[in-house]
């Protein structure tokens, strides 16, 4: 199966052009949400709508792919858990962090467990 080339997409939308070179998705406001991706092929240019998810920081986007460890234990003090990601692949010109840390709130179930553990420790 042929893989999509970095920055290059065959056959742009509604076009006879052979190879379209697509830039990054640039949100219309701030650093996430709906935006546009510009493409060029010879003298032709096109803009297509795209979206950068708002729950990702910029370096977590399609430009940077990470391999993540399992989630750590719930921290009862902060009500969050953490996992680390190691860079797996970056778009050629993307300046990605080698490692990243992601936090998320614990589910009510794990939060309760963590609190119970914390309580036991105090006895």
């Amino acid at each position: 199966v042929a893989k999509k080339k970095d920055k290059v997409k065959k056959g742009g939308p509604g076009s006879e052009c052979a190879e379209w070179a697509w830039g990054p998705c640039t949100p219309s406001s701030k650093d996430c949400g709906v935006g546009f991706r510009e493409g060029t092929c010879g003298a032709q240019t096109q803009r297509i709508r795209c979206r950068v998810p708002c729950n990702w920081k910029k370096e977590f986007g399609a430009d940077c792919k990470y391999k993540f460890e399992n989630w750590g234990a719930c921290d009862g003090g902060t009500g969050t858990k953490v996992r680390q990601g190691t860079l797996k692949k970056a778009r050629y010109n993307a300046q990605c962090q080698e490692t990243i840390r992601v936090t998320k709130p614990c589910t009510p179930k794990t939060k309760a467990k963590a609190k119970a553990k914390k309580g036991k420790g105090k006895d």
Epitope: K3, K5, D6, K7, V8, A21, K65, T86, L87, K88, K89, A90, Y92, N93, A94, Q95, C96, Q97, E98
Partner: antibody, heavy 117, light 107 residues
């Protein structure tokens, strides 16, 4: 820090093939694009293509589409350049380099390929 | 493909002088332009990435400017070890291309 050690160069007859190796040591070989570049004697630098070890995605200079094949072996932390149907004008020093947009690149020492009968 | 034209082909300077090397792209390449130094028998060494970003371990006398189509590598005060060939390279689109090089030689 990544160290790249190249091997496989030498004297080869016209029409023959040759496989060059680029062995990486140090951090994260599989995370970065591996470029192959050549330099004919007394000439400038010419990009052959690149491959990403994580999924073997390959982007080849169309000039070399019938000449070069890129591959990787993650288990051996190595990248390979197979050159086919060699001609006198393929005589050059061949370099591999590991590219990260964030930290820059690391180059192998280069390996000389001489095509002559 | 994007053509990079370097000038001058040869630059003759004395140590201590300021060196200005030019690289012009055949079309806009944003800031996707890198500068390399190469000495005889050695692999190229990256000096500046993305037009003006410094590289760890490279002396501060090397600096770059851009973006767009016209790029400059400046060596504020040339040291004896700086005499070498300098190449620019673009990574804006495939194939990656290099300029023809500028040879910095001792006057």
């Amino acid at each position: 820090q990544v160290q790249l050690v190249q091997s496989g160069g030498g004297l080869v007859k016209p029409g023959h093939s040759l496989r060059l190796s680029c062995a990486a040591s140090g951090q994260s070989f599989s995370s970065y694009w591996m470029n192959w570049v050549r330099q004919a004697p007394g000439k400038g630098l010419e990009w052959i293509g690149m491959i990403h070890p994580s999924d073997s995605e390959t982007i080849l200079n169309q000039k070399f589409k019938d000449k070069a094949t890129l591959s990787v072996d993650i288990a051996k932390n190595s990248a390979y350049l197979q050159m086919n149907s060699l001609r006198a004008e393929d005589t050059a020093v061949y370099y591999c380099s590991s590219w990260s947009a964030k930290r820059g690149d690391f180059w192998g020492q280069g390996t000389l390929v001489t095509v002559s009968s | 493909e994007i053509v990079l034209t370097q000038s001058p082909a040869t630059l003759s300077l004395s140590p201590g002088e300021r060196a200005t090397l030019s690289c012009r792209a055949s079309e806009s390449i944003s800031n996707n332009l890198h500068w390399y130094q190469q000495k005889p028998g050695q692999a190229p060494r990256l000096l500046i990435k993305y037009a003006s970003q410094s590289i760890s371990g490279i002396p501060a006398r090397f600096s770059g400017s851009g973006p767009g189509t016209d790029f400059t590598l400046t060596i504020s005060s040339v040291e004896p070890e700086d005499f070498a060939v300098y190449y620019c390279q673009q990574s804006n689109s495939w194939p990656l291309t290099f300029g023809g090089g500028t040879k910095l030689e001792i006057k």
